[in-house]
């Protein structure tokens, strides 16, 4: 039985340079308890894009659009996109602990950047 699903509905998103990119993610349960974080790339060299609890992410805002009972919205918007922002973005659920441990990742959304 699946305990929880992390759903990134968009396999890819294309955004013009200078515009904002919305990266969608919904999660089907708060259990196991623990935070949601966004990363660009996978593996040990991945880059933290957003963590609500700590850090400063001036280009990122949260975008909660879903009012459905069956899931919760953990989508983000990244402003002023540049070609350097291209890559695959992952919405990742962690299980609370010391330290928190990765529990489940979404399938990823590939962001491509078009010229203005």
């Amino acid at each position: 039985e699946e305990e929880l699903q992390v759903i990134q509905p968009d396999k890819s998103v294309s955004v013009a340079a200078g515009e904002s990119a919305i990266l969608h993610c919904t999660v089907t349960s708060l259990i196991p308890v623990g935070p949601i974080q966004w990363f660009r790339g996978a593996g040990p060299a991945r880059e933290l894009i957003y963590n609500q609890k700590e850090g400063h992410f001036p280009r990122v805002t949260t975008v909660s659009e879903s009012t459905k009972r069956e899931n919760m919205d953990f989508s983000i918007s990244i402003s002023n996109i540049t070609p350097a922002d291209a890559g695959t973005y992952y919405c990742v659920k962690f299980r609370k602990g010391s330290p928190d441990t990765e529990f489940k990742s979404g399938a990823g959304t590939e962001l491509s950047v078009r010229a203005k």
């Epitope: 699946e2 349960s29 708060l30 259990i31 935070p35």
Partner: antibody, heavy 118, light 112 residues
Framework: EVQLVESGGGLVKPGGSLRLSCAAS????????MSWVRQTPGKGLEWVAT????????YYPDSVKGRFTLSRDNAKNSLYLQMNSLRAEDTAVYYC???????????WGQGTTVTVSS | DIVLTQSPASLAVSLGERATISCRAS??????????MHWYQQKPGQPPKLLIY???NLESGVPDRFSGSGSRTDFTLTINPLQAEDVATYYC??????????FGGGTKVEIK
């Protein structure tokens, strides 16, 4: 129609044990996070325990941690709360409640009364 | 622990008028722009019943005279217009990712 039916409440002496059960019907039990919430006239509503849909993860407030154990049997659509080392302050109406997303409590049973007294 | 303070503890409102209940959290219950604050109605001898989930979403089957609003630490449940069957005690509840989950102390709504 969703139904949650609690049983197992009663009078027990301090230090004693009780096992509460909750029989679920009318929904896909194995997809739901399940919890117990208790209510006393003095303290109001208090969250007591939560278990993940597959039964892997359990959570308790400090007030019951180490004394209460929550489990489930998805094949039987049943939830169980084993309560040990009971104290007078555990006296309450205990409600079984479902949480589709592990967030709000969607459905509640009618409750079962636990009285801890010598 | 996140403490939820409801006010007033009791409220008497005339039929057809507006009833407003406040719930203040000791710290934010918002995650990614969603407020994990919920409202329940409890009538004597009955279990609580979900009215509003995640601050402002009306649970299926609940009359639209009930509404919820607020974010971060300040939340409101409004009943407008109040009807006789709304006499009950109302509770707020937070389910942020910081355990333990907690409830407000309740607000008893009566008819003036």
């Amino acid at each position: 129609e969703v139904q949650l039916v609690e049983s197992g409440g009663g009078l027990v002496k301090p230090g004693g044990s009780l096992r509460l059960s909750c029989a679920a019907s009318g929904f896909t039990f194995s997809s739901y996070v399940m919890s117990w919430v208790r209510q006393t006239p003095g303290k109001g509503l208090e969250w007591v325990a939560t278990i993940s849909s597959g039964g892997t993860y359990t959570y308790y407030p400090d007030s019951v941690k180490g004394r209460f154990t929550l489990s489930r049997d998805n094949a039987k659509n049943s939830l169980y709360l084993q309560m040990n080392s009971l104290r007078a302050e555990d006296t309450a109406v205990y409600y079984c409640a479902s949480q589709l997303t592990g967030s709000e409590f969607d459905y509640w049973g009618q409750g079962t009364t636990v009285t801890v007294s010598s | 622990d996140i403490v939820l303070t409801q006010s007033p503890a009791s409220l008497a409102v005339s039929l057809g008028e507006r009833a407003t209940i406040s719930c203040r959290a000791s710290e934010s219950v918002d995650l990614y722009g969603t407020s994990f604050m919920h409202w329940y109605q409890q009538k004597p001898g009955q279990p609580p019943k979900l009215l509003i989930y995640r601050a402002s979403n009306l649970e299926s089957g609940v009359p639209d005279r009930f509404s919820g609003s607020g974010s971060r630490t300040d939340f409101t449940l409004t009943i407008n217009p109040l009807q006789a069957e709304d006499v009950a005690t109302y509770y707020c509840h937070q389910s942020s990712d910081e355990l333990p989950w907690t409830f407000g102390g309740g607000t008893k709504v009566e008819i003036k």
